[in-house]
């Protein structure tokens, strides 16, 4: 299987950004997806049956979705850094993807470069 992510993305301070990963090239069942920040603190978990658990430190700034992704709102400069999606699957095991978010002071247009992590 392969994790495809939104790669390196930038967004404006005060704006919002969608963190998105997609698992392909496998028939494995996704049982859970974890979203972690650069310091490895959990932002959210999405269990296949029970839905989302949003961690309280982020509950006012994180919106679940679209899909298995996460929308991070009211961005601050401190949000700059790495984000990780971890897919727990059966029977394959664990897949991990990385996204780098840069929060910009200026009104630089948002862009994203898609790339794959084996």
């Amino acid at each position: 299987g392969t994790i495809e992510t939104t790669g390196n993305i930038s967004a404006k301070k005060g704006g919002s950004v969608i963190l998105q990963c997609h698992l392909s090239s496998t028939m494995a069942q996704v049982t859970q997806v974890n979203w972690e920040q650069h310091d490895h603190s959990l932002l959210a978990i999405r269990n296949a049956e029970l839905g989302w658990h949003i961690y309280p430190a982020f509950k006012d700034r994180v919106a679940p979705g679209p899909g298995l992704g996460l929308t991070l709102q009211s961005l601050t400069m401190n949000d700059t850094g790495e984000y990780f999606c971890t897919y727990h699957t059966y029977p394959d095991g664990t897949y991990r993807g990385r996204i780098f978010l840069e929060v910009l002071e200026s009104s630089v247009a948002e862009h994203s470069a898609r790339f794959q992590i084996p």
Epitope: E49, G51, H53, H88
Partner: antibody
Framework: EVQLQQSGPELVKPGASVKISCKTS????????MHWVKQSHGKSLEWIGG????????SYNQKFKGRATLAVDKSSNTAYMELRSLTSEDSAVYYC????????????WGQGTTLTVSS | DIVLTQSHKFMSTSVGDRVSITCKAS??????VAWYQQKSGQSPKLLIY???YRNTGVPDRFTGSGSGTDFTFTIDSVQAEDLAVYFC?????????FGTGTKLELK
């Protein structure tokens, strides 16, 4: 005020089935997961499973899968747990517990239903 | 399944004492731990969620800390009404599991 009202105590014979109900009030039933938890006498707590009423998603503890069935009736805001092929090991107090909003921990609990399995 | 170990089944304390209850997970659960209080003949009550957040209406003498595999629940100044069994629970992955419980009793 959030309330979870469970059905009364049950005395059943080995091999039989039981269905415990959990009638809720004071919140939007479909927006919160309902968990079921077993507590054997003087022992710890055991998660049986959880059900998300909005989409019917159910997660079972493998230990109970096949013998426990979780269900909801959205029209009456009631959750149910059926347990089949009962043995004396199933004698315990069973709780329904509401998952907190966008969380997996349980912020409101029913009063518990005592199940006794005996011939 | 993730196993949660509460090393003390019983803890003796006096009113006004500070007491800490520990919970060790068999694998990394980040901060996905809750603490419940259960008084005799009653249902469990949520005190702490996500390792360190107090539930609504819970007195500030109750605190939680930890991440990864080691978690601590502390009562700063024990009151008589705090005598109960305390359970930790992990909600990092299903099946969600509970610790064996620690009963707080008076010396």
């Amino acid at each position: 005020e959030v309330q979870l009202q469970q059905s009364g105590p049950e005395l059943v014979k080995p091999g039989a089935s039981v269905k415990i109900s959990c009638k809720t009030s004071g919140y939007t039933f479909t927006e919160f997961t309902m968990h079921w938890v077993k507590q054997s006498h003087g022992k710890s707590l055991e998660w049986i499973g959880g059900l998300k009423p909005d989409n019917g998603g159910i997660s079972y503890n493998q230990k109970f899968k096949g013998r426990a069935t979780l269900a909801v009736d959205k029209s009456s805001n009631t959750a149910y747990m059926e347990l089949r092929s009962l043995t004396s090991e199933d004698s315990a107090v069973y709780y329904c517990a509401r998952g907190a909003y966008y969380r997996y921990d349980a912020d409101y609990w029913g009063q518990g239903t005592t199940l006794t399995v005996s011939s | 399944d993730i196993v949660l170990t509460q090393s003390h089944k019983f803890m003796s304390t006096s009113v006004g004492d500070r007491v800490s209850i520990t919970c060790k997970a068999s694998q990394d659960v980040k901060t996905a731990v809750a603490w419940y209080q259960q008084k005799s003949g009653q249902s469990p009550k949520l005190l702490i969620y996500s390792a360190s957040y107090r539930n609504t209406g819970v007195p500030d003498r109750f605190t939680g800390s930890g991440s990864g595999t080691d978690f601590t629940f502390t009562i700063d100044s024990v009151q008589a009404e705090d005598l109960a069994v305390y359970f930790c629970q992990q909600h990092y992955s299903t099946p969600f599991t509970f610790g064996t419980g620690t009963k707080l009793e008076l010396k």
